[in-house]
């Protein structure tokens, strides 16, 4: 089982849409696949896929989940809020027939506020 996640870095404006993709590949067929998205280590959702369908379509606040055969799991955040900023990780495990798990690399999501004055904490600082 292998999981490839993208993009590595995603910068979007508040109120727009963000799409995170997780490619889950397994050399042999599987009956049930457990998938999980986390943000900053906290679980957003943990549905499973069987018979080509997701057991859950919602994933965290304003998050929609979709599965496109043969291997694409997509998390769509719409509309994006400042709270969506963080580090997202996709994890997958074949539960049937044999337990095997893998996780992707981090996708870092940065959300730019509509109001630039809210962005003070993002001002670059340089060493003296």
């Amino acid at each position: 089982l292998s999981v490839q996640q993208g993009p590595n870095l995603l910068q979007v404006r508040q109120g727009s849409q963000a799409t995170l993709v997780c490619q889950v590949d397994q050399a042999t067929a599987w009956e049930r696949l457990r998938v999980k998205w986390t943000k900053d280590g906290a679980i957003l959702c943990q549905p499973y896929i069987t018979n080509g369908s997701l057991s859950l379509g919602v994933c965290g606040p304003q998050g929609r989940l979709s599965w496109q055969a043969p291997s694409h799991l997509t998390l769509q955040l719409d509309p994006v809020s400042l709270n969506h900023s963080g580090a997202y990780v996709c994890w997958a495990a074949v539960e049937i027939p044999e337990l095997e798990e893998a996780e992707g690399n981090i996708t870092r999501l940065f959300v730019d506020p509509d109001d630039p004055t809210q962005n003070r904490n993002r001002i670059a600082s340089f060493p003296g």
Partner: antibody, heavy 120, light 113 residues
């Protein structure tokens, strides 16, 4: 371009352990998402999957051989190996190493094969 | 274990004529989760290692001549050669990749009449 090359003794005595090595060139054996396999072909017969090992070290063996088979990887040498214990004349075959990727469920690169005869 | 049954075992063909090989599996090789059939076709030319021709039942590997085609779904699969050439001689094997253990058909020997 990935290339595989089998090596090992061409003659093994009954009850001993058959040991073969597959050297991988043009590709890192520790790359995520890849499996490294052994397949054999008895003289004039069809193909038999022995087993494979994945990039994480997980092994999958043919149940008909499982009690006698060990597949392992040496990442420092970019090699993987096959050990088959307690061999008999029925283990006489051409042994192939092959590779496949998680995202493509097929063996896309094969070694040229090495003939192993079990005889006293 | 999934049993793969190939027919015919021997196939004499005149160059330029079509050829067809059947492969039946003892259980379905289709997955609704991935929308794929886990069935591959290989050609082993005399004295060589097998080479992949077709994967996922119908996808031709890059570089394989378009006279080779694969079809079928579930348990019933076919490899067709539209016009056989002398270089097509060898043993053809179907193989499932649905689950472990992976198994191959017994092979079909294609020979030129």
């Amino acid at each position: 371009q990935v290339q595989l090359q089998e090596s090992g003794p061409g003659l093994v005595k009954p009850s001993q352990t058959l040991s073969l090595t597959c050297t991988v060139s043009g590709f890192s054996i520790s790359t995520s998402g890849y499996y490294w396999s052994w397949i054999r072909q008895h003289p004039g017969k069809g193909l038999e999957w022995i087993g494979y090992i994945n990039y994480g070290g997980g092994t999958y063996y043919n149940p008909s051989l499982k009690s006698r088979v060990t597949i392992s990887v040496d990442t420092s040498k970019n090699q993987f190996s096959l050990k088959l214990s307690s061999v008999t004349a029925a283990d006489t075959a051409v042994y192939y190493c092959a590779t496949m990727a998680d995202r493509f469920a097929f063996f896309d690169v094969w070694g040229q094969g090495t003939m192993v005869t079990v005889s006293s | 274990d999934i049993v793969m049954t190939q027919s015919p075992l021997s196939l004499p063909v005149t160059p330029g004529e079509p050829a067809s090989i059947s492969c039946l599996s003892s259980q379905s090789l289709f997955s609704s989760n991935t929308n794929r059939n886990y069935l591959n076709w290989y050609l082993q030319k005399p004295g060589q290692s097998p080479k992949l021709l077709i994967y996922h039942a119908s996808t031709r590997l890059s570089g394989v001549p378009d006279r080779f085609s694969g079809s079928g779904s579930g348990t019933d699969f076919t490899l067709k050669i539209s016009r056989v050439e002398a270089e097509d001689v060898g043993d053809y094997y179907c193989q499932h990749h649905y689950e472990t253990p992976l198994t191959f058909g017994d092979g079909t020997k294609l020979e030129i009449k």
